[in-house]
């Protein structure tokens, strides 16, 4: 491999669907080849802690922990192999949470979907796309993060209390943008800076809550690579609703 060559990193949220993109460049005049294309996806899990090496997370069956004192890079294994006619193979039974979009495949999109993504799915993925006259390739590294929203102070609030909501995702770089919203009836209502709402990066400060603030609050973190995550928190403010 060329020194300094970077495997693209794809971020996903634990417990949410994850798309592992693969759309190799194919000249337009050759798109007819795609109907007979096959694809093989492989996964090399990230190295686990030295204590125990888990089994293949996307392979079915039990995953016995193998005692180990050293950090061995886990073996690469086949997640899914799809033949020209759409025939799926791999370790049986194939996990339903590992999916290829059949229509996408005929358009040159060989993306793998994990529904949902789990922590053990992190690692390097490679796809080999098998055509009649050439072999195409995709590589990426999947990183998984956990999303959370915390309230300080936690728990139920009383009218006129203050609260800070902190929206976070376990990723080292800062989000490019943070949008706050409230779920009201059928839609989302954006939360804007006002005397009642103070916005600072991933924090929302409510200086004086009222029972009307009870209910779901949400934030959307968007990163420079386009990855975004939506997080919800249910705020509880005790007290009588003011007369309307």
């Amino acid at each position: 491999l060329q020194p300094g060559a970077e495997v693209p990193v794809v971020w996903a949220q634990e417990g949410a669907p994850a798309q592992l993109p693969c759309s190799p460049t194919i000249p337009l005049q050759d798109l007819s080849l795609l109907r007979r294309a096959g694809v093989t996806w492989q996964h090399q899990p990230d190295s686990g802690p030295p204590a125990a090496a888990p089994g293949h997370p996307l392979a079915p069956g039990p995953h016995p922990a193998m005692p180990s004192t050293r950090r061995h890079p886990p073996h690469r294994y086949t997640v899914l192999s799809v033949g020209p006619g759409g025939l799926r193979s791999g370790r049986l039974p194939l996990q339903p949470r590992v999916q290829l979009d059949e229509r996408g495949r005929q358009r040159g999109d060989f993306s793998l979907w994990l529904r949902p993504a789990r922590r053990a799915d992190a690692g390097e993925y490679r796809a080999a796309v098998h055509l009649r006259d050439r072999a195409l390739s995709c590589r990426l590294r999947l990183r998984l993060g956990q999303a959370s929203m915390t309230a300080s102070p936690p728990g139920s609030l009383r009218a006129s209390d203050w609260v800070i909501l902190n929206c976070s995702f376990s990723r080292p770089d800062r989000p490019a943008s943070v949008h706050w919203f409230r779920n009201r009836g059928q839609g989302r209502v954006p939360v804007r800076e006002s005397p009642h709402h103070h916005l600072a990066e991933s924090f929302l400060f409510l200086p004086q809550v009222s029972p009307m603030d009870s209910g779901p609050w949400g934030c959307i973190l968007t990163y420079r690579d386009g990855f975004n995550v939506s997080i919800m928190y249910n705020l509880t403010v005790l007290g009588l609703e003011p007369p309307t």
Partner: antibody, heavy 124, light 106 residues
Framework: QLQLQESGPGLVKPSETLSLTCTVS??????????WGWIRQPPGKGLEWIGS???????YYNPSLKSRVTISVDTSKNQFSLKLSSVTAADTAVYYC????????????????WGQGTMVTVSS | DIQMTQSPSTLSASVGDRVTITCRAS??????LAWYQQKPGKAPKLLIY???SSESGVPSRFSGSGSGTEFTLTISSLQPDDFATYYC????????FGGGTKVEIK
């Protein structure tokens, strides 16, 4: 360190089938993400690609040889094999096996590691 | 099928010379071209892939350029170890090699 070693008979009779095996050491074919190919070179001439195989069994072949070529893989032995049927004197060549890499690009096709080659003569 | 035409077929040069080998494809192959060096009785050695990317360990005097149908391999200052035969190979559709260019001592 990855090494490839071709093996098979050095002499084949016309009209018979040429059979060669490439043994891979230093990496597992079944857990690697490479294609594995066969290339030949007639004495004093240039290189000709024969075909390539992925560990999953997917192959693609030189169209001019396709009707006579079968490439297979045996992951349990970490080997891949070439069979070329109905040989003639024109099939006399040094036969190389090689690893086909994608180099973090969209396409496989460049051979970065080669065996040392084995000479096969077609003669009665 | 895509044909690859190399020129010249033989090239006489001296140590220190700048050497250029040309490879032409019968149709556009984008940048999917590799260059190899082969010495007598030895297997080919990959020098360049994707038209201009150097394989690790290859001396910096070797460089590749071009895209579409016209490609060149340049040796900026020929060294005694560089006298060999050079092949181009396309991998846009199937895999085909050029006829080779033998670089010999003038």
């Amino acid at each position: 360190q990855l090494q490839l070693q071709e093996s098979g008979p050095g002499l084949v009779k016309p009209s018979e089938t040429l059979s060669l095996t490439c043994t891979v050491s230093g990496d597992s074919i079944s857990s690697s993400s490479y294609y594995w190919g066969w290339i030949r070179q007639p004495p004093g001439k240039g290189l000709e690609w024969i075909g390539s195989i992925f560990y999953s069994g997917n192959t693609y072949y030189n169209p001019s040889l396709k009707s006579r070529v079968t490439i297979s893989v045996d992951t349990s032995k970490n080997q891949f094999s070439l069979k070329l049927s109905s040989v003639t004197a024109a099939d006399t060549a040094v036969y190389y096996c090689a690893r086909e890499d994608d180099f973090l690009t969209d396409y496989y096709g460049a051979f970065d590691i080669w065996g040392q080659g084995t000479m096969v003569t077609v003669s009665s | 099928d895509i044909q690859m035409t190399q020129s010249p077929s033989t090239l006489s040069a001296s140590v220190g010379d700048r050497v250029t080998i040309t490879c032409r494809a019968s149709q556009s192959i984008s940048s999917w071209l590799a260059w190899y060096q082969q010495k007598p009785g030895k297997a080919p050695k990959l020098l360049i892939y994707k038209a201009s990317s150097s394989e690790s360990g290859v001396p910096s005097r070797f460089s590749g350029s071009g895209s579409g149908t016209e490609f060149t391999l340049t040796i900026s200052s020929l060294q005694p170890d560089d006298f060999a035969t050079y092949y181009c190979q396309q991998y846009n559709s199937y895999l085909t090699f050029g006829g080779g260019t033998k670089v010999e001592i003038k």
